[in-house]
């Protein structure tokens, strides 16, 4: 029961986590900047992985997508890749874990198969969570680096002068959503791996083999290392290794001239 609960909870936590990773990837507010030195109007600028938006105090809002791949920073491309890999792995993990759930019966699937599927999905969730955390952390690092570099970026061009506007770089809501979602997916994956240990059969059931000698019936059980004579109080061989499977030891055994080893 505890295994089923752990597996089920791991699945739900991972599901919430992956939904969060998808939400974070689609969100526009990965970084936000307040332009406080704007001479015309207060401008609130925010960027996502896919587009950049500007919102003015008048209420005017405009978003533009990054339609080019060549002009984008390599780090932004890397973050996109990490988030997509996280989503794909998480989605596959969810699909696998649905079939691995102990509460769902699919044909005559054995517990060992379910255990393997649970472990597979667990590992996928862990990697998915790590990808999301890594992606968000890389972007956060990029923002911090840009903030410290912004004072040193000034150059004179043919048409005059270009300089960086001093802005306050702040972490957008998407970063926090991504960190939490990645963490949840990671925790869900760990729970699935723990559940896998409970699902897997701990020991193999061996069938006891009876060896009958002429005149004396001796039952040799490799699992229990206990011999008993065919006569007297133990004519019915007691089960020594009880793994749940019926063996020939459960059938009454009588001595016979025609018993062979």
């Amino acid at each position: 029961m505890a295994v089923t609960a752990c597996q089920g909870l791991g699945f739900v936590v991972s599901l919430i986590g992956i939904a969060g990773i998808i939400a974070a990837t689609c969100m526009d507010q990965w970084s936000t900047q307040d332009l406080y030195n704007n001479p015309v109007t207060a401008v609130f600028n925010y960027q996502g992985l896919w587009r950049s938006c500007v919102r003015e105090s008048s209420g005017f809002t405009e978003c533009r997508g990054y339609f080019t791949l060549l002009g984008l920073p390599a780090m932004l491309q890397a973050v996109r890749a990490l988030m997509i890999v996280g989503i794909v792995l998480g989605a596959i993990g969810l699909l696998v874990s649905i079939f691995a759930l102990k509460c769902i019966r699919i044909g005559s699937m054995e517990d060992s198969a379910k255990a393997n599927m649970t472990l597979t999905s667990g590992i996928m969730f862990i990697v998915s969570g790590l990808c999301a955390i890594a992606g968000v952390s890389v972007f956060a690092n990029m923002l911090v680096t840009n903030f410290w570099m912004s004072t040193a970026n000034m150059y004179t061009g043919m048409g005059g002068m270009v300089q960086t506007v001093q802005t306050r770089y702040t972490f957008g809501a998407a970063l926090f959503v991504g960190w939490v979602a990645g963490g949840l997916t990671l925790i869900g994956g760990v729970m699935m791996c723990i559940a896998c240990r409970g699902l897997a059969p701990e020991e193999t059931n061996y069938k006891a083999v009876s060896y009958h000698a002429s005149g004396h019936s001796v039952a040799y059980k490799p699992g229990g290392f206990k011999a008993s004579t065919g006569f007297g109080s133990n004519t019915k061989n007691k089960k020594i290794y009880d793994g749940g499977a019926r063996t020939e030891d459960e059938v009454q055994s009588y001595p016979s001239k025609h018993d062979y080893v």
């Epitope: 900047q33 950049s52 003015e56 920073p73 270009v162 506007v165 802005t167």
Partner: nanobody
């Protein structure tokens, strides 16, 4: 390389009109605020007029009612229509554009080299 180029300056008589243009070019993702500044000989640079991407405008008190600022977002171009020009409007007019650069994920402030406007009889 991002750059802005001003044009339309020249010599004009008092009471006359002039239209200045500022065109931004280069690897620009989005131009947000565009502003006209001016600097008269021996004086500090001052704001003349500015316009946001959404169309919000701001004018210096000295030019209100005489100058009109406008822009074409699609062409990344800003215009300054100057009417009823006075001798005190004589200055070098600079274009300033605040552009969001996707390549560095930061705001850039781009300045032009200026265009001279002389109001004289």
């Amino acid at each position: 390389e991002v750059q802005v180029v001003e044009s339309g300056g020249g010599l004009v008589q008092p009471g006359g009109s002039l239209r200045l243009s500022c065109a931004a070019s280069g690897n620009i993702f989005r131009i947000d605020t565009m502003v006209w500044y001016r600097q008269a000989p021996g004086k500090q640079r001052e704001l003349v007029a500015g316009i946001s991407r959404g169309g919000t405008t701001n004018y210096a008190h000295s030019v209100k009612g005489r100058f009109t600022i406008s822009r074409d977002n699609a062409k990344n171009t800003m215009y300054l229509q100057m009417n009823s020009l006075k001798s005190e409007d004589t200055a070098t007019y600079y274009c300033n554009a605040q552009a969001w650069d996707v390549g560095t994920i930061r705001y850039l402030e781009v300045w032009g080299q200026g265009t001279l406007v002389t109001v004289s009889a």
